[in-house]
Interface confidence: low
């Protein structure tokens, strides 16, 4: 992502366009790398990540990775370029506005991953696609 000493302004945003020719701005994502988590056996969870980060490249999307093994549960939140694999998996749902978790095969652990392309969309990770995100408690997001 952008080095913190670089001031982003209206004038120096990288000019990248989407398929329709519209200017595409870098994504805002939760970006706490790997943190221990208490998210378990729930239809959805908030990331509890206090950091909203501006992705370095306009094409990057938000990613969340939930992992559970015999010792702990972790949640990873990052920006990532969907053209590149992450944890050896393709980000097949990168265009989704919501972060819908999908299980991936990893030996020795339970591994779920999601990606999405709306601002801070990896703050609310969803394990059940029918989950209704209108719960007002979900709006009490932790950030600065």
């Amino acid at each position: 992502t952008i080095p913190p000493h670089v001031q982003k302004s209206v004038n120096n945003d990288m000019i990248v366009t989407d398929n329709n020719g519209a200017v595409k701005f870098p994504q805002l994502c939760k970006f706490c790398d790997v943190r221990f988590s208490t998210c378990d056996n729930q239809k959805s969870c908030m990331s509890n990540c206090s950091i909203t980060s501006i992705c370095e490249k306009p094409q990057e999307v938000c990613v969340a990775v939930w992992r559970k093994n015999d010792e702990n549960i972790t949640l990873e939140t990052v920006c990532h370029d969907p053209k590149l694999p992450y944890h050896d998996f393709i980000l097949e749902d990168a265009a989704s506005p919501k972060c819908i978790m999908k299980e991936k095969k990893k030996p020795g652990e339970t591994f779920f991953m999601c990606s999405c392309s709306s601002d801070e969309c990896n703050d609310n990770i969803i394990f059940s696609e029918e989950y209704n995100t209108s719960n007002p408690d979900l709006l009490l997001v932790i950030f600065q």
Epitope: I2, P3, P4, S9, V10, F31, C32, S50, I51, F143
Partner: antibody, heavy 121, light 107 residues
Framework: QVQLVESGGGLVQPGGSLRLSCAVS????????MSWVRQAPGKGLEWVSS????????HNTDSVKGRFSISRDNSKNTLYLQMNSLRAEDTAVYFC??????????????WGQGTLVTVSS | DIQMTQSPSSLSASVGDRVTITCRAS??????LNWYQQKPGKAPKLLIY???SLQSGVPSRFSGSGSGTDFTLTISSLQPEDFATYYC?????????FGQGTKVEIK
């Protein structure tokens, strides 16, 4: 040049209301979370409230919940703090600050010059 | 909430002195620790972010170190413009909290 300019402070009676504004220029305001931080006379810094870049999410310190409301107008590059049911302990200089988070690091920078709110009868 | 405790609350030093200010968090905050300088009647100014990264434009005599719960701000050779109050702030979790400040005065 990045600038944050607060206004709207003044003397108000306990129970009264004020609306602070922070006019922003020099950066892409709509891309950043913004915050209010206050400083009581002769005291330290206290975070008050934050709002997401799009304005749909807010978070407040416990002591102002139900009384203060943060908002923003991205078309006007302006941040607001609506303060109701003011108390003597809300007397402070109120700073607006840009929240910049990159590479997983987070801090307040830069800050406005501050506006003084005095709650007294 | 995470409590941040700075020491000392104030100190007197001379130009050219090496000054060290410490900040302790009530729980581990990894390296999510920032340092600010504030002069009377002015807004705080970011000096150090992420415990040890120097903000652009800040003189190299300022440095930060530490991780977990214990952090240090060091001014290697105090200059006249460095007399001010310094605050640490954790950004590990909400609410972001500040230390009570350390006032650096002229001896």
């Amino acid at each position: 040049q990045v600038q944050l300019v607060e206004s709207g402070g003044g003397l108000v009676q306990p129970g009264g209301s004020l609306r602070l504004s922070c006019a922003v220029s020099g950066f892409a305001f709509r891309r950043y979370a913004m915050s209010w931080v206050r400083q009581a006379p002769g005291k330290g810094l206290e975070w008050v409230s934050s709002i997401s870049a799009s304005g749909d999410r807010t978070h407040n310190t416990d002591s102002v919940k139900g009384r203060f409301s943060i908002s923003r107008d991205n078309s006007k590059n302006t941040l607001y703090l609506q303060m109701n049911s003011l108390r003597a302990e809300d007397t402070a200089v109120y700073f607006c600050a840009k929240g910049l988070a990159s590479s997983g690091k987070n801090y307040f920078d830069p800050w406005g010059q501050g506006t003084l709110v005095t709650v007294s009868s | 909430d995470i409590q941040m405790t700075q020491s000392p609350s104030s100190l007197s030093a001379s130009v050219g002195d090496r000054v060290t200010i410490t900040c302790r968090a009530s729980q581990s905050i990894s390296s999510y620790l920032n340092w600010y300088q504030q002069k009377p009647g002015k807004a705080p100014k970011l000096l150090i972010y992420a415990a040890s990264s120097l903000q652009s434009g800040v003189p190299s005599r300022f440095s930060g170190s530490g991780s977990g719960t214990d952090f240090t701000l060091t001014i290697s050779s105090l200059q006249p413009e460095d007399f001010a109050t310094y605050y640490c702030q954790q950004s590990y979790s909400t609410p972001p909290t500040f230390g009570q400040g350390t006032k650096v005065e002229i001896k």
